[in-house]
Interface confidence: low
């Protein structure tokens, strides 16, 4: 079993933290503050590099073997003889010895690596696992901050379940060891629709357009919109399509709806003429290599009609219980206002009538009809 290196063990050594793939500078200082003979060695006494009195950097082995090791010649005159290790590898984690002025200084280098599970492109709802690889004997703690400021912390593995769109961006992971810190940046892309639900409010006969912007464009996949009209008890397919190289192609479509799907991203679906029978809810699914994304779609349709001696305003589709339907003559007090889906006025006066669907002080939709004279039928 690997023994943890205690604070006391490290006290005699200088500790340097590094990141895999980057560079580390191991310090070695002369008390004289001037150029002097020095040698850097591995702990097994193999020479790495040094300066033996002529101001020339001498390497301890063949250039191919030692090309990652260097020093800062410009610092030698000030009595500083650092060992620079480039393109750090996990196996560089060890003790290095600097010999100068008849003394030896030990520097412990610990190289860390933080990686994201399998891929940095994940679907909304999936889990992100960040794994810290650390040298034997180290006991770091790690804390990561998401782009929206949420802190997660733990030992060698940190997990975040149910990723959201706002988790896209740069995650900052700070590794803390013996009061020293090293910071990692990991760019995570959460593949998602940019909103969780879309609701369109339309008067009968109008066109409805749904746009489904994605926060990515480089993925291929296929999708389908399943629809459940309010009057139905089942979902049925409205349209299926594929996305390839940012182009959208319709595979199958319900004939009577005359649905139109834009050929380029963002996904845009148009219903040329809505009617009460279309009102309801749908589920758009987009299947990618990594899994499936879902988007809820709602269509609320309003119809105002005059039949015989009655003016009727009707709404169909997913409305909230707090929504109110109001039928009134324009610029006059509300004649009828109910928290329900149908309101009627018998024997309406001639003039312009307005039907409003509102929630609190927000009007969701407004449909108007000109009442010509009592007893006339119009839709």
């Amino acid at each position: 079993e690997q023994k943890l290196i205690s604070e006391e063990d490290l006290a005699a050594k200088t500790l340097v933290l590094g990141k895999e793939g980057e560079s580390a500078e191991l310090p070695c200082e002369s008390s004289q503050k001037k150029i002097t003979v020095f040698t850097w060695k591995f702990s097994d006494q193999r020479k790495i590099l040094g300066q033996h009195g002529k101001g020339v950097l001498i390497r301890g082995g063949s250039p191919s073997q030692f090309d990652r090791f260097d020093s800062k010649k410009g610092a030698w005159e000030k009595g500083s003889f650092p060992l620079i290790i480039n393109k750090l590898k996990m196996e560089d984690s060890q003790t290095y010895i600097c010999e100068l002025e008849n003394r030896k200084e030990e520097v412990e280098l610990w190289v860390f690596k933080v990686t994201a599970n399998s891929d940095t492109h994940l679907l909304q709802g999936q889990s992100l696992t960040l794994t810290l690889e650390s040298p034997p004997g180290s006991s770091p703690s790690v804390q990561c901050r998401s782009p929206r400021g949420k802190n997660i912390q733990g030992g060698k593995t940190l997990s975040v379940s149910q990723l959201e769109l706002q988790d896209s961006g740069t995650w900052t992971c700070t590794v803390l060891q013996n009061q020293k810190k090293v910071e990692f940046k990991i760019d995570i892309v959460v593949l998602a629709f940019q909103s969780t639900a879309i609701t369109a409010y339309k008067s009968e006969g109008e066109s409805a357009e749904f746009s489904f912007p994605l926060n990515f464009a480089e993925e291929n996949g296929w999708g389908e919109l399943m629809w459940k009209a309010e009057k139905d008890s089942f979902f049925q397919p409205w349209i299926s399509f594929s996305i390839k190289n940012k182009e959208v192609s319709v595979q199958k479509s319900t004939k009577d709806l005359k649905l139109q799907l834009k050929e380029t991203l963002p996904l845009t679906l148009k219903i040329p003429q809505v009617s009460l029978q279309f009102a309801g809810s749908g589920n758009l699914t987009l299947t990618l290599d990594k899994g499936t994304l879902h988007q809820e779609v709602n269509l609320v349709v309003m119809k105002v009609a005059q039949l015989n001696n009655t003016l009727t305003c009707e709404v169909m589709g997913p409305t909230s219980p707090k929504m109110r339907l109001t039928l009134k003559q324009e610029n006059q007090e509300a004649r009828v206002s109910e928290e329900q889906k149908v309101v009627q006025v018998v024997a309406p006066e001639t003039g312009l009538w307005q039907c409003l669907l509102s929630e609190g002080d927000k009007v969701k939709m407004d449909s108007r009809i000109q009442v010509l004279s009592r007893g006339v039928n119009q839709t």
Epitope: S139, S141, Q143, R145, R148, G149, K150, N151, Q153, G154, G155, T170, T172, L176, Q179, K181, E183, K185
Partner: antibody
Amino acid sequence: QVQLVESGGGLVKPGGSLRLSCAASGFTFSDYYMNWIRQAPGKGLEWVSYISSSGSTIFYTDSVKGRFTISRDNAKNSLYLQMNSLRAEDTAVYYCAREDYSNYEDYYYYYTGVWGKGTTVTVSS
Amino acid sequence: EIVMTQSPAALSVSPGERATLSCRASQSVSSKFAWYQQKPGQAPRLLIYNASTRATGIPARFSGSGSGTEFTLTISSLQSEDFAVYYCQQYNNWPYTFGQGTKLEIK
């Protein structure tokens, strides 16, 4: 000893700009996350912004996004807050604060242990 | 954002007595939670971090407890210098948020 000293406050008209500075001493400035926190007259405390030790990670509270910019100069041991398009509701004492941490049982905990004395910003016509 | 609610808004206690201040978070903040003391014209002073750890130089009469959403600051025997405004704060999610404060007054 560890010290944070804010400067740059003053009276400014709505829509105007100010730049606050915070001079740090007595510690290795480049090792610490830094923060700006404000307190409106007679009111509670509100976090405005923080910046990571390297300056690469920055957060703002929603009410100042797009108007305020936090920055740091580790070589000068200084923290800054550039405030543009100032509003009356930005009137407050602005504190510069250091985010410390303690390592405990494989976790570490942040806390704002060191504060400056504050600088007053008044936005009024 | 996480809303921190302190109670009571003001508390009158006699010196030498015990004072208990409460703070509730609108969602769990684990133990990433701190208490601060502020006197007029001064910057806040950290008392407790990590919900229950006393900051350097803070007397033992101050103690913090709780985790998740419910937190308590207890001052076991009030001294004259303890009368001030106390703020709670979470640092689990950005934006970090403070409670509205509890004013501790001399009875």
